[in-house]
């Protein structure tokens, strides 16, 4: 899997999209996990509703939300109030039994807020963009990592 980079601005919301083959993954729940080290396990952050037919309901875990467009084949993850510690390597996964297939490897990069001070207009209010169908994301930039680029700093 290539790694796709999503860049967001600190303090704002970042939306990550993971496209997949809706027929191949029909009936499967999805998850978003954080890679712990280059060879470490992928720690589950949030998963879609336990009832696959309710995958359209947005599920939150802290400041991270997940929702699944099962017909269109797009898993959407929202990272609310992005912080520097959110930077790192993640995976979108398709679950089947105790197994998980990787849909996309994602490197989240957090850019410094260009404004040192933010007024109320910059704050994210809970509840907005609850639906993937018309979610609007500001400051979401994605690109694929070039072959040979390393998402983790080399260990000494």
């Amino acid at each position: 899997h290539n790694t796709t980079v999503f860049q967001g601005v600190a303090g704002q919301s970042l939306q990550v999209s993971c496209p997949y083959d809706s027929m191949k993954h029909w009936g499967r729940r999805k998850a978003w996990c954080r890679q712990l080290g280059e060879k470490g396990p992928c720690q589950r952050v949030v998963s879609t509703h336990n009832l696959w037919l309710l995958s359209f309901l947005r599920r939150w875990n802290g400041s991270t939300a997940i929702t699944d467009d099962t017909l269109g084949g797009t898993l959407t993850i929202t990272l609310r109030n992005l912080q520097p510690h959110d930077a790192g390597l993640y995976q979108c996964q398709s679950l089947h039994g105790s197994e998980a297939d990787t849909l996309r490897k994602v490197l989240v990069e957090v850019l410094a807020d260009p404004l040192d001070h933010r007024d109320a207009g910059d704050l994210w209010f809970p509840g907005e963009s609850e639906s993937f169908e018309d979610a609007h994301v500001e400051h979401s930039i994605s690109r694929s990592l070039l072959e040979g680029e390393i998402p983790f700093p080399p260990t000494s």
Epitope: F56, R59, A65, T70, L71, G127, E133
Partner: antibody, heavy 117, light 106 residues
């Protein structure tokens, strides 16, 4: 404060049809999944149907499939429930409710449906 | 479907008392439980979500707890305005509700 106002209830004969409406205000309606929940005369709560924010996805519990259709008009901020082949056991107070993270965080005041000959 | 059982249909208490309303799920629901309060003539209002988190504006005398199949709503010091029906609700699978517990004030 979120506001949900149901309307359209009334007295219907068995086998009849009725469409309930719910007007939403003071929040970004299209950004939220919505549900209809009913409360029987015995005060039991039953989930009737759910619909995603954009209206593409709907869900009905097995017991509600076939006779109920949930829909929404995001341009007008309205949620609907079309009911057909009504039976006496459909007599209830019908509430629309907003979804947040699985649970239902705000409910309307309800509209009453009575099915009787 | 998951059955949510509220064993007490009625509970009688006095102002200032501590009262606990219980709810048992027919299978584990991983804390995907909410509690609603319905005062006479009103619609249900969300009190607690994810088993233990208070909704905005809910007084801190209301506390939720539990895991697995057993969940509890506790009112630490009952007030006259707490006279209401209380429902538990699981959103782990196809949504179901408890039968309700009516809190009566002596």
């Amino acid at each position: 404060e979120v506001q949900l106002v149901e309307s359209g209830g009334g007295l219907v004969k068995p086998g009849g049809s009725l469409k309930l409406s719910c007007e939403a205000s003071r929040f970004t309606f299209s950004s939220y999944a919505m549900s209809w929940v009913r409360q029987t005369p015995e005060k039991r709560l039953e989930w009737v149907a759910a619909i995603s924010g954009g209206g593409r996805y709907t869900y009905y519990p097995d017991s509600m499939k076939g006779r109920f259709t949930i829909s929404r008009d995001n341009a007008k901020n309205f949620l609907y429930l079309q009911m057909s082949s009504l039976r006496s056991e459909d007599t209830a107070m019908y509430y629309c409710a907003r979804h947040y993270d699985g649970y239902l965080d705000y409910w309307g005041q309800g509209t009453t449906l009575t099915v009787s000959s | 479907d998951i059955v949510m059982t509220q064993s007490h249909k009625f509970m009688s208490t006095s102002v200032g008392d501590r009262v606990s309303i219980t709810c048992k799920a027919s299978q584990g629901v991983s804390t995907a439980v909410a509690w609603y309060q319905q005062k006479p003539g009103q619609s249900p209002k969300l009190l607690i979500y994810w088993a233990s988190t208070r909704h905005t504006g809910v007084p801190d005398r209301f506390t939720g707890s539990g895991s697995g199949t057993d969940y509890t709503l506790t009112i630490s010091s009952v007030q006259a305005e707490d006279l209401a029906l209380y429902y538990c609700h699981q959103h782990y699978s196809t949504y179901t509700f408890g039968g309700g517990t009516k809190l009566e004030i002596k």
